[in-house]
Amino acid sequence: SGKSFKAGVCPPKKSAQCLRYKKPECQSDWQCPGKKRCCPDTCGIKCLDPVDTPNPTRRKPGKCPVTYGQCLMLNPPNFCEMDGQCKRDLKCCMGMCGKSCVSPVKA
């Protein structure tokens, strides 16, 4: 959609084990109220408060890995838009289902 990008990035997904999976709360940031973003959580996709990212425009070294397969999800949510929104050396790359922070491959 032509709407502008919501600030911040999804909080890191907790490593806890899920005991009860929830149906998705949202399909994109624009289905979340206020500043909340549509994010993966331990037990599903939820509207969560974003976290700030330093220097979001910085491009990081390396290339995005090639992805294979077809996404079965309609309007997959993007969990990042730019490299600078990703922690450490991770890059923001288009995966099978939307953009996410992944380890780059050597250029």
Epitope: K23, P24, E25, C32, P33, K36, C47, M73, L74
Partner: antibody, heavy 122, light 108 residues
Framework: QVQLQESGPGLVKPSQTLSLTCTVS??????????WSWVRQLPGKGLEWIGY???????YYNPSLKSRVTISIDTSKNQFSLKLSSVTAADTAVYYC??????????????WGQGTLVTVSS | EIVMTQSPTTLSVSPGERATLSCRAG??????LAWYQQKPGQAPRLLIY???TRATGIPARFSGSGSGTEFTLTISSLQSEDFAVYYC??????????FGQGTKVEIN
């Protein structure tokens, strides 16, 4: 005993916006265990899921209707609402509000409103 | 979206007999499947969820089975109040949730 009741005009003109409200009684709409849904049934046809809303205001819509649908919630009144814009005769249907478990292990629409027939005609 | 196909379209059964209704999913939905009963002029009523769990207040003569793409609703001994239209519905992974086109169970 949870009860749901739809209200709104039964006749809408083509190109206008259909607006319906569902009032929930016998239980709080603020429970995190449920999504609040709209489902419609075209005359003599099957059922079509329109979308749902969570108490927090987050929504998920059927992609086939997404560009025309808005579902909103008013927790203070224990109500949620449907707006469907740019309606045509093809939107003539019985519209139901329903409660749906928010977890996969409680899936299905366990409580329904009685349904309201909305006719699109000039 | 996942297409749900029900068969037969109409099932003619005598009271006291057994009725078996089928529902096929276009792709696997695990056990995320519900069955509903709808009578003329009424809202649907949830019978079964999780493919085989009876909803609150549903008589034991209704049972559901299956997983993946093939599902069955069985009514062991049809009562007069069971003549209605039955719908299956999937709620797997990502919406849109979709319904089958319905099976009408009529008196033979």
């Amino acid at each position: 005993q949870v009860q749901l009741q739809e209200s709104g005009p039964g006749l809408v003109k083509p190109s206008q916006t259909l607006s319906l409200t569902c009032t929930v009684s016998g239980g709080s709409i603020k429970s995190g265990d449920y999504y609040w849904s709209w489902v419609r049934q075209l005359p003599g046809k099957g059922l079509e899921w329109i979308g749902y809303i969570y108490y927090s205001g987050s929504t998920y819509y059927n992609p086939s209707l997404k560009s025309r649908v808005t579902i909103s919630i008013d927790t203070s009144k224990n109500q949620f609402s449907l707006k469907l814009s740019s309606v045509t005769a093809a939107d003539t249907a019985v519209y139901y509000c329903a409660r749906e478990g928010s977890y996969y292990d409680s899936g299905g629409f366990d409580y329904w409103g009685q349904g309201t027939l909305v006719t699109v005609s000039s | 979206e996942i297409v749900m196909t029900q068969s037969p379209t109409t099932l003619s059964v005598s009271p006291g007999e057994r009725a078996t209704l089928s529902c096929r999913a276009g792709q696997s939905v695990g056990n995320n499947l519900a069955w509903y009963q709808q009578k003329p002029g009424q809202a649907p009523r949830l019978l079964i969820y999780g493919a085989s769990t009876r909803a609150t207040g549903i008589p034991a003569r209704f049972s559901g089975s299956g997983s993946g793409t093939e599902f069955t609703l069985t009514i062991s001994s049809l009562q007069s109040e069971d003549f209605a239209v039955y719908y299956c519905q999937q709620y797997n992974n990502w919406p849109p949730w979709t319904f089958g086109q319905g099976t009408k169970v009529e008196i033979n």
